[in-house]
């Protein structure tokens, strides 16, 4: 690595990043007829334009606007599932319950899921060596700003009852510093959203505590109530059984505690 290249604390751009984004775009638009009109080369150009030749600590939401415009997508606003620190189960769920949607079920979320990227000021190079870490380096980095932008837009689009899956195994079941806690909660629109419904996912087999009474959940309830949105909470004691009941709701075990 040349000595002049900035060394950041986070991992570098995911290898084959341009090819991955382009391939994901093509795959997504093939599977989702409503997005067949999207030109994936234009999408990649807009994505690249958001961070290439820019200082990776000086990225703004404005940088991503061309990409946001190209990726505009209408998701049924009453079928949105948010999640925090429990991505895998949320995605397993929407794979079964096909009429509910996480951010990663949309084109833009699908393109960027699990990827890292950044560029360098004044060069057209992608930095595969290192990228800024949100804590150790800077918050206005390409990845963080992207997720903040798409998460805000996703939350703003929600209506009626919005569901959120939370990880009951974490010390902070609701974390104010997560994307959900810092972005999505504050961008739900009270004139459109009646209720935020939290599903608290238990980890332990024998964990029968009511995690809806957890202090961090009460904090979430307080934040939501102050925004004139109702709040409800449900314990999911057995996530495996929960998924089974989503697949087969006629199963008699689904009438007991899940």
């Amino acid at each position: 690595v040349p000595r002049w290249r900035q060394q950041w604390s986070g991992p570098g751009t995911t290898k084959r990043f341009p090819e991955t984004v382009l391939a994901r775009c093509v795959k997504y638009t093939e599977i989702h007829p409503e997005m067949r009109h999207v030109d994936c080369q234009s999408v990649w150009d807009a994505f690249k334009g958001a961070f290439i030749s820019k200082h990776p600590c000086n990225i703004t939401e404005e940088d991503y606007q061309p990409l946001m415009k190209l990726g505009t997508q209408t998701v049924p606003c009453n079928k949105i599932l948010l999640w925090s620190r429990i991505k895998d189960l949320a995605h397993q769920f929407t794979q079964v319950q096909r009429d509910m949607f996480t951010l990663e079920d949309t084109l833009l979320g699908y393109l960027a899921d699990d990827l890292t990227w950044c560029g360098e000021f004044n060069t057209s190079k992608i930095n595969y060596q290192s990228c800024p870490d949100w804590r150790k380096d800077c918050s206005n980095n390409p990845v963080s700003v992207f997720w903040k932008t798409v998460s805000r837009r996703f939350a703003e689009a929600a209506c009626d009852v919005v569901h959120v899956m939370l990880n009951g195994s974490r010390s902070k079941i609701f974390d104010k510093n997560s994307t959900f806690g810092s972005v999505e909660v504050h961008n739900l629109q009270p004139e459109k959203v009646q209720t935020l419904e939290a599903w608290v996912i238990h980890g332990g087999r024998e964990d029968s505590r009511d995690l809806c009474q957890d202090p961090t959940i009460k904090e979430l309830e307080s934040i939501i109530s102050k925004r004139n949105i109702q709040f409800s909470c449900k314990n999911i004691y057995r996530p495996d059984k929960f998924l089974q009941c989503v697949k087969n709701p006629e199963d008699s075990s689904c009438t007991s505690e899940i």
Epitope: D160, T195, V246
Partner: nanobody, 125 residues
Framework: EVQLEESGGGLVQAGGSLRLSCAAS????????MGWFRQAPGKEREFVAA????????YYMDSVKGRFTVSRDNAKNTVYLQMNSLKPEDTAVYYC??????????????????WGQGTQVTVSS
Amino acid sequence: EVQLEESGGGLVQAGGSLRLSCAASGRTLSNYHMGWFRQAPGKEREFVAAINWSGLNTYYMDSVKGRFTVSRDNAKNTVYLQMNSLKPEDTAVYYCAAQFFAAAVGRDSAKYAYWGQGTQVTVSS
């Protein structure tokens, strides 16, 4: 499985009221959104009202808004449909149905896993 049983139907004059009940035998309804549907002779079954599992959110077809109220008592495993200002066009067999909670409340009957046998409501003019 969930056994749903409707009651409270009958013959009533236009402008009158009825309260339908839907009870689940031996099973909890707290994992289910509950819907009311109706079917008039020679017509398709149609959505009337629904209430989500927690009871916080209710939904109505336009023609019954302001006249019908859906509610639930999870402790009693019962869902209610209070029908006021009844009209002859409300005449139908009324069914209650249960939809697993992990989805948006449905107006589409296909989303409901369990159904009652129905109760007849007749509104005379």
